[in-house]
């Protein structure tokens, strides 16, 4: 008799999830010599322990604490790049500007990037059929709690000038409901962070508007200023040229506005 299984509204656990996490861990520790001491089997065991046999709507930050401990890593606090709705460009940037870090450049972020996972209460099975959707089912699901936890800790670690890349093509360039808007903004530490500098990335070739004047950017400035952190904003009119100039800053065309 087939066992009844809870049907959730979101996609199920990513295929080959255990193998993917383990393989990513091994790859990361090979690429980053300072992390070569990490025992990837222990990392997987801690990751698994956070959600296996637990109700997927009842996950807490505490569940991920053993994993957090194993993911201990040096991140220069003044080299942090946050992003919202423009992940690919942020990652392309840190691949070139190697001394800056997005969350996904850390071990923990790298392990979980673009993956979905959940378990079932009282069974050791991983649910590959469906997982809770943040809106339709519950917010305390394994994926959402993981990203909320690591995003909060990442923002708490930041200091001096923190950069954030925002998508100028979105109707809400700054979205209060994004992870950046709901978690990271509120966990920057005013005693450590002097300035939040927003980079608004333009989508259209001929778009010469000053998107730093957008109402949602003004809203971000207001939130940040109330937290006693300075705010600055730059338009990145040509993201392709921006990346090219990060690669080759001596190029003569890189002195003009990008």
């Amino acid at each position: 008799v087939p066992r009844w299984r809870q049907q959730w509204s979101g996609p199920g656990t990513t295929k080959r999830f255990p193998e993917t996490v383990l393989a990513r861990c091994v790859k990361y520790t090979e690429i980053h010599p300072e992390m070569r001491h990490v025992d990837c089997q222990s990392v997987w065991d801690a990751f698994k322990g956070a959600f296996i046999s637990k109700h997927p709507c009842n996950i807490t930050e505490e569940d991920y604490q053993p994993l957090m401990k194993l993911g201990t890593q040096t991140v220069p606090c003044n080299k942090i790049l946050l992003w919202s709705r423009i992940k690919d460009l942020a990652h392309q940037f840190t691949q070139v500007q190697r001394d800056m870090f997005t969350l996904e450049d850390t071990l923990l972020g790298y392990l979980a990037d673009d993956l979905t996972w959940c378990g079932e209460f009282n069974t050791s099975k991983i649910n590959y059929q469906s997982c809770p959707d943040w809106r339709k089912d519950c917010s305390n699901n394994p994926v959402s709690v993981f990203w909320k936890t690591v995003s909060r800790r990442f923002a708490e670690a930041a200091c001096d000038v923190v950069h954030v890349m925002l998508n100028g093509s979105r109707s809400k360039i700054f979205d209060k409901n994004s992870t950046f808007g709901s978690v990271e903004v509120h966990n920057l530490q005013p005693e450590k962070v002097q300035t939040l500098e927003a980079w608004v990335i333009h989508g259209g070739r001929e778009d010469s508007r000053d998107l730093c004047q957008d109402p949602t950017i003004k809203e971000l400035e207001s939130i940040i200023s109330k937290r006693n952190i300075q705010f600055s904003c730059k338009n990145i009119y040509r993201p392709d040229k921006f990346l090219q100039c990060v690669k080759n800053p001596e190029d003569s065309s890189c002195t003009s506005e990008i």
């Epitope: 993911g71 201990t72 890593q73 040096t74 850390t106 670690a157 200091c159 005693e191 450590k192």
Partner: nanobody
Framework: EVQVLESGGGLVQPGGSLRLSCAAS????????MSWVRQAPGKGLEWVST????????DYADSVKGRFTISRDNSKNTLYLQMNSLRAEDTAVYYC??????????RGQGTLVTVSS
């Protein structure tokens, strides 16, 4: 600007004790969780212990549980790590850091603990 200065390290025999101190300045010390992390020769960063801002809550790595005790004196802006029953594998540079991790930045120079007979 957050600044920390670790002290109290040294050479000690296996089974011995040391007390590390960390003097902090540049921020409201009592508002922040504080941690000890360590780096053994040729190894990566390892989290050791964390204490809440008030001092009411502590957490330890399994490898030091029952042997190390983290504490703080908020009136002196100072963090401590009492290390008992020291082992050769505790040999490392010990750093104190603001926050609870897992992401840390070195603020101080650290203090070297060498456990050897």
């Amino acid at each position: 600007e957050v600044q920390v200065l670790e002290s109290g390290g040294g050479l000690v025999q296996p089974g011995g004790s040391l007390r590390l101190s960390c003097a902090a300045s540049g921020f409201t010390f009592s508002s922040y969780a504080m941690s000890w992390v360590r780096q053994a020769p040729g190894k990566g960063l390892e989290w050791v212990s964390t204490i809440s801002g008030s001092g009411g809550s502590t957490d330890y790595a399994d490898s030091v549980k029952g042997r190390f005790t983290i504490s703080r004196d908020n009136s002196k802006n100072t963090l401590y790590l009492q290390m008992n029953s020291l082992r050769a594998e505790d040999t490392a540079v010990y750093y104190c850091a603001d926050g609870r991790g897992p992401f840390f930045d070195y603020r101080g120079q650290g203090t070297l603990v060498t456990v050897s007979s």
